[in-house]
């Protein structure tokens, strides 16, 4: 669909005569009839197949025709068509004299024709005007013409319909060839698909309008690239939605149980050493002079019973002082003035003289200790039970009650998860508190070394002299493909170059 436009510019009829040669009285009141039709090699009368149009009286004898497109659209003349423009045409322009006001053909005398021109040819759709001038013996007509597409029609022959829109069905304008040109922020065949915020995650985000990024369930953040952890997850993160992977030092399903109470809470006072001992629990090892669960209590210097051989301890500002019983002396009453003759050894201890009878030493029977065998042995004081085992005195002996997962006389052995040899392909098994772990040999992976993986035998760059390295997957060994001039399994040996010939 388009319009053939004809712009009449100037008509010259200096003598004011008709085609018959008869003069017009008083002058030739001139109007035009235009006929547009299909291309004919010889333009002949017949129907104006592309349309026709008449003008009012435009002037007398010779006159210029002013551009009157704004005031009623009479010049240029419009010949609309609603078919595909064929690219060729025939045009007939007749100038007529109007003696009266009635311009209908039947109202005019047959000899009222002033002049008639006919042209034919090719004409492409475009904005540029083609200027033409036709001259006869008595008249001259200057005019220009063009074919343009109607609104919303595009292309070389005005056959492509395109109507710009900005609604649910599309967001585009039309290009000169009739193709769609999406408005900024839209894409797709009909520009219906919004372009999301730059960086918006392809799978986890979407948008309903440009520069937007709406997150699918389980995702958050400006670009929907952060997963939402499980509801209630305290000290954990996620790599996919609704997970809770605990941060270092936290345990429990919701990572809310403190496995590193020592670091997070520093409960031990007065320089004591803190040891984590499970979820939310810890043990303080006090420095000398302190006691209590958190080593918060200062010990009296005498609480450690420093005075031996029955000496009595007295606290002093700068330490303590031992009052020794008869027969003993020294800072801790450790030296005796007694000899074996004084029977100083209790509980069946046997006395041995030392320093030519100047002193003695007691050899104590089992279950007794002290320089005079005066103390009963508490076999649990040395904390012999490992891994949190509980020490129990049983008369002359002792035993350890072990925590789950441990065994042995002193609970020193972890009940081995490795006993059933769970690691395949020669993997090495390690017992951990949380379970077991397999260290796999080269070429194997997986939790139990059950997956065979190919070794990159070329990783160590074993081939010399720019040779190409390949891994033989059947043997997991390297193969060197030598360049010209080198041999050997690693291409390390040069070969003799061919002799040079004198010609």
């Amino acid at each position: 669909s388009g319009v053939f436009q004809l712009q009449l510019q100037e008509f010259v009829n200096e003598r004011g005569v008709l085609a018959s040669g008869r003069p017009c009285e008083p002058g030739c009141r001139t109007f035009f009839r235009v006929c547009l039709k299909h291309f004919q090699a010889v333009v002949s009368p017949g129907p104006c197949t592309f349309g026709s149009v008449s003008t009012p009286v435009l002037g007398t004898n010779s006159f210029a025709v002013r551009d009157d497109s704004s005031g009623g659209g009479r010049n240029p003349l419009q010949l609309p068509f609603n078919f595909t423009w064929p690219g060729t045409f025939s045009l007939i322009i007749e100038a007529w004299h109007a003696p009266g006001d009635d311009l209908r053909p039947e109202a005019l005398p047959p000899d009222a024709l002033i002049s008639k021109i006919a042209i034919q040819g090719s004409l492409a759709v475009g904005q540029n005007w083609l200027l033409d001038e036709q001259t006869s013996t008595l008249t001259r007509l200057r005019y220009s013409y063009r074919v343009i597409c109607s609104d919303n029609y595009y292309g070389d022959n005005c056959s492509r319909l395109c109507k710009k829109r900005n609604d649910h069905f599309g967001h585009y304008v039309c290009q000169p060839d009739g193709n769609l040109s999406c408005l900024p922020g839209w894409t797709g065949e009909y520009c219906q698909q919004p372009i999301c915020l730059s960086g918006c995650h392809e799978q986890n985000g979407y948008c309903s309008k440009p520069a937007e990024c709406l997150c699918r369930p389980g995702w958050q953040g400006r670009l929907c690239n952060e997963c939402i952890p499980h509801n209630g997850c305290r000290h954990g993160t996620c790599s996919t939605p609704w997970q809770c992977t605990c941060d270092e030092g936290w345990g429990g399903l919701f990572c809310d149980q403190d496995l590193n109470y020592c670091t997070h809470h520093s409960p031990c006072k007065n320089g004591a050493t803190c040891s984590n001992s499970g979820q939310r629990s810890y043990t303080c090892t006090c420095r000398p002079g302190y006691t209590g669960v958190d080593c918060e209590l200062e010990l009296s210097e005498c609480d450690s019973n420093p005075c031996r051989n029955g000496g009595s301890c007295k606290d002093q500002e700068d330490g303590y002082h031992c009052l020794c019983p008869p027969g003993y002396y020294g800072l801790h009453c450790e030296h005796s003035t007694l000899s074996c003759a004084d029977s100083p050894c209790f509980n069946g201890g046997s006395c041995r003289e030392r320093n030519q009878g100047a002193s003695y030493a007691c050899e104590c029977p089992p279950n007794f200790t002290g320089s005079n065998c005066e103390k009963k042995v508490d076999r649990c004081t040395s904390n012999p039970c490992a891994n949190g085992g509980q020490c129990l005195n049983r008369g002359p002996s002792r035993m350890c009650r072990c925590r789950p997962g441990f065994t042995g006389t002193y609970c020193e052995r972890h009940v081995s998860d490795c006993a059933r040899n769970p690691c395949a392909h020669g993997g090495t098994c390690h017992d951990l508190e949380s379970g077991l772990m397999c260290t796999c040999p080269a070429g194997f992976s997986g939790r139990r070394c059950e997956v065979r993986t190919s070794i990159d035998a070329c990783a160590s760059s074993p081939c010399f002299n720019r040779a190409t390295c390949y891994t033989d997957l059947s043997t997991d060994t390297f193969v060197c493909n030598c360049p010209y001039g080198f041999v050997g399994s690693r291409c390390e040996f040069p070969v003799g170059l061919p002799p040079s010939f004198p010609w």
Epitope: H230, P404, G405, S434, G435
Partner: nanobody, 120 residues
Amino acid sequence: EVQLVESGGGLVQPGGSLRLSCAASGFTFDDYAIGWFRQAPGKEPEEISCISSSGGITYYADSVKGRFTISRDNAKNTVYLQMNSLKPEDTAVYYCATPGIAACRGIHYTGQGTQVTVSS
């Protein structure tokens, strides 16, 4: 595909008992710790109990200590939660979960849950 399916929930009177089961598939069962948590309407989820992959380490929340017992049968790929002396405040949806590792640290997969209602 990892799947955890809970069963055994229902309506029980205060003081009564229930035994919940969690049937697992899609992974090497005896490699993973399995735990139970519950969520009452409008409340945060609460961890109830967890058992390590070997079964040697078990954890119980203070609110259920002495009343609930967790156990696992590696041959049947199932974890059980025996709930005795039930109270109205135990009413919730009970979920089983695994951290995807041997120790009770985090949540990687959860089931769809089973409703437990304690009411007279």
